[in-house]
């Protein structure tokens, strides 16, 4: 029960996380104009991974896509790539995890197969979350670097004159959405990996078999349930291990005095 809950919760958390990563990737507010020195401005600039926008005081907003590919900074391209890889891995992970869910029955899928799929999707979610966090962090680092460079330029202008025309950019809402979403996807992935441990059948799990005395004078012999040895001296008995063991119904029993007590 706890395994199913952990797996289900992991799936839901990852689903929310990946939805957040997609939302962050599509958002325009990755960097927003810093209004610290100029809170009353005619226009407000903000930029995303795919386009930059200008909003006027009237509320009118105009956005322009980055229609060039070669002219864009390498860091921006890297962030785009990280976010897309995160989305793709997350989407595949979601697809795999749907089939891995314990509460969903698909044919006669073994628990071991579900465990493997759960682990696979968990790893995919972890990598997806890390990609998103890395992408957002790279962009944030780029902003911080540019912010302090433009701050330095602002007060060391030509001939010591103060320049206040330079637009500085600070963290946009998309960065926070991306960090939270990446974290959720990561947590969901870890939960899936934990659930996998509970789903996987233990190697040392022996199936219970009930034995009947096969003759009038034969009594149960004490002995360890060893994987490779027969039970007592009866060589016809199968190995009591893994798939070789028989259940109570399958084991052939002969009528004896012990059966009619």
């Amino acid at each position: 029960m706890a395994v199913t809950a952990c797996q289900g919760l992991g799936f839901v958390v990852s689903l929310i996380g990946i939805a957040g990563i997609i939302a962050a990737t599509c958002m325009d507010q990755w960097s927003t104009q810093d209004l610290y020195n100029n809170p009353v401005t005619a226009v407000f600039n903000y930029q995303g991974l795919w386009r930059s926008c200008v909003r006027e005081s009237s509320g009118f907003t105009e956005c322009r896509g980055y229609f060039t590919l070669l002219g864009l900074p390498a860091m921006l391209q890297a962030v785009r790539a990280l976010m897309i890889v995160g989305i793709v891995l997350g989407a595949i992970g979601l697809l795999v995890s749907i089939f891995a869910l314990k509460c969903i029955r698909i044919g006669s899928m073994e628990d071991s197969a579900k465990a493997n799929m759960t682990l696979t999707s968990g790893i995919m979610f972890i990598v997806s979350g890390l990609c998103a966090i890395a992408g957002v962090s790279v962009f944030a680092n780029m902003l911080v670097t540019n912010f302090w460079m433009s701050t330095a330029n602002m007060y060391t202008g030509m001939g010591g004159m103060v320049q206040t025309v330079q637009t500085r950019y600070t963290f946009g809402a998309a960065l926070f959405v991306g960090w939270v979403a990446g974290g959720l996807t990561l947590i969901g992935g870890v939960m899936m990996c934990i659930a996998c441990r509970g789903l996987a059948p233990e190697e040392t799990n022996y199936k219970a078999v009930s034995y009947h005395a096969s003759g009038h004078s034969v009594a149960y012999k004490p002995g360890g349930f060893k994987a490779s040895t027969g039970f007592g001296s009866n060589t016809k008995n199968k190995k009591i291990y893994d798939g070789g063991a028989r259940t109570e119904d399958e084991v052939q029993s002969y009528p004896s005095k012990h059966d009619y007590v």
Epitope: A42, V43, V54, E56, F60, E62
Partner: nanobody, 118 residues
Framework: QVQLLESGGGLVQPGGSLRLSCAAS?????MGWFRQAPGKGLERVAN????????WLADSVKGRFTISRDNSKNAVYLQMTRLRAEDTAVYYC??????????????WGQGTLVTVSS
């Protein structure tokens, strides 16, 4: 140089309707309307992107005004309904070559006066 020719202004009673027209001498990227009420600053009212027809309307006129375009005539129309006294202003047609932002507006019309009074 692009010439903008405005028409349709006049006196109208509150609750009445009016249609402003603006024709450009050649095609532009964006066309729209700004207004200036007596003793007030310039206010963006509406605009339309000529290529894809995307429109924008100020919150103060939403549900009352509509903007449309006719690419074959390089014209833009502002249909004003349920007019109020606060809509009284000089309405200016504006056009941009590459942007619709106020700072990037390349061409302005002479303006047409709209008076809403009973």
């Amino acid at each position: 140089q692009v010439q903008l020719l405005e028409s349709g202004g006049g006196l109208v009673q509150p609750g009445g309707s009016l249609r402003l027209s603006c024709a450009a001498s050649r095609s532009t990227y964006c066309m729209g309307w700004f207004r200036q009420a007596p003793g007030k600053g310039l206010e963006r009212v509406a605009n339309v992107y000529m290529r894809n027809g995307d429109t924008w309307l100020a919150d103060s006129v939403k549900g009352r005004f509509t903007i449309s375009r006719d690419n074959s005539k390089n014209a833009v129309y502002l249909q004003m309904t349920r007019l109020r006294a606060e809509d009284t202003a000089v309405y200016y047609c504006a056009a941009g070559r590459s942007s619709c932002l106020e700072a990037s507006i390349s061409y302005w019309g002479q303006g047409t006066l709209v008076t809403v009074s009973s």
